[in-house]
């Protein structure tokens, strides 16, 4: 029983340290983000940025991501499309 408790304690400590290291690693990776808005049904991110989300005008909730850098709002007669664009900054 003592051995089991010791193993559990060690495992817990490993988890704590690992979790802390992962958190620090994630924290040190900065995300640079910007928003792009276009008239019509497409909005494109600059080079090096990836689409992380899209928004559509005319209360349209149907969209997809094209060629990795472009938001496409799928409703007819779209008046505007927005893209949230992010890239990792070490």
């Amino acid at each position: 029983k003592t051995l089991c408790s010791m193993e559990e304690a060690i495992n817990e400590r490993i988890q704590e340290v690992a979790g802390s290291l992962i958190f620090r690693a994630i924290s040190s990776i900065g995300l640079e983000c910007q928003s792009v808005t276009s008239r019509g049904d497409l909005a494109t991110c600059p080079r090096g940025f990836a689409v992380t989300g899209c928004t559509c005008g005319s209360a349209c909730g149907s969209w997809d991501v094209r060629a990795e850098t472009t938001c496409h709002c799928q409703c007819a007669g779209m008046d505007w499309t927005g893209a949230r664009c992010c890239r990792v900054q070490p």
Epitope: R39, T44, P46, R47, A67, T81
Partner: antibody, heavy 117, light 110 residues
Framework: EVQLVQSGAEVKKPGESLRISCKGS????????INWVRQVPGKGLEWMGM????????KYSPSFQGHVTISTDKSVSTAYLQWRSLQASDSAIYYC??????????WGKGTLVTVSS | QSVLTQPASVSGSPGQSITISCTGT?????????VSWYQQHPGKAPKLMIY???KRPSGVSNRFSGSKSGNTASLTISGLQAEDEADYYC??????????FGGGTKLTVL
């Protein structure tokens, strides 16, 4: 190495149909738009339209909408530009170009189309 | 769809600097900082020289630079060399997610 290999020169008569091709290699074909650009010899460049090879969603310049059709076959990494009824004014060099974000980064060598009776 | 306005021709002597302008509207050049510039030698396909207004692709000489003010973008070539003689085209993404080109500028190196 990114390459866009275009089909050879064509000589056609007015009213005939035509499809020219552009095969992409050296990159993931479905991750980039393919654009078509027209150049009448001795004149400037005109953007015709672009297509997403993933599902062939196309966007056209108002100047070319309805006169040409842009399509792709992603299984063979190839894009196409097609006319149902050619006119003499379609005589030009046609470039296929990879679109990366806001710019056109890799160009094919062009296909010369001559339409003459 | 109207093209962007470029001078038909410019010229300069080796070693000099030249600037080519590209004027559009608030719906294209002025609406985005996403003007690109292309060089085309006779009988060849165009080549991307500047993207996103002022950035150079790898392999393009730092003698080429781009800028923008309002609805006008500019390409500057410094230390002009014989091999720079070519046609230059500006292009802008538009607020309708289409692209438009300038009419082209013929650069002559005297």
């Amino acid at each position: 190495e990114v390459q866009l290999v275009q089909s050879g020169a064509e000589v056609k008569k007015p009213g005939e149909s035509l499809r020219i091709s552009c095969k992409g290699s050296g990159y993931t074909f479905t991750n980039y738009w393919i654009n078509w650009v027209r150049q009448v010899p001795g004149k400037g460049l005109e953007w015709m339209g672009m297509i997403d090879p993933t599902d062939s969603y196309a966007k056209y310049s108002p100047s070319f909408q309805g006169h040409v059709t842009i399509s792709t076959d992603k299984s063979v990494s190839t894009a196409y530009l097609q006319w149902r009824s050619l006119q003499a004014s379609d005589s030009a060099i046609y470039y296929c170009v990879r679109g990366y974000s806001y710019d056109l980064d890799y160009w094919g060598k062009g296909t010369l189309v001559t339409v003459s009776s | 769809q109207s093209v962007l306005t470029q001078p038909a021709s410019v010229s300069g002597s080796p070693g000099q600097s030249i600037t080519i302008s590209c004027t559009g509207t608030s719906s294209d050049v002025g609406g985005y900082n996403y003007v690109s510039w292309y060089q085309q030698h006779p009988g060849k396909a165009p080549k991307l020289m500047i993207y996103e207004g002022s950035k150079r692709p790898s392999g393009v000489s730092n003698r080429f630079s781009g800028s923008k003010s309002g609805n006008t973008a500019s390409l500057t070539i410094s230390g002009l060399q014989a091999e720079d003689e070519a046609d230059y085209y500006c292009s802008s993404y538009t607020t309708r997610s289409t692209r438009v080109f300038g009419g082209g500028t013929k650069l002559t190196v005297l």
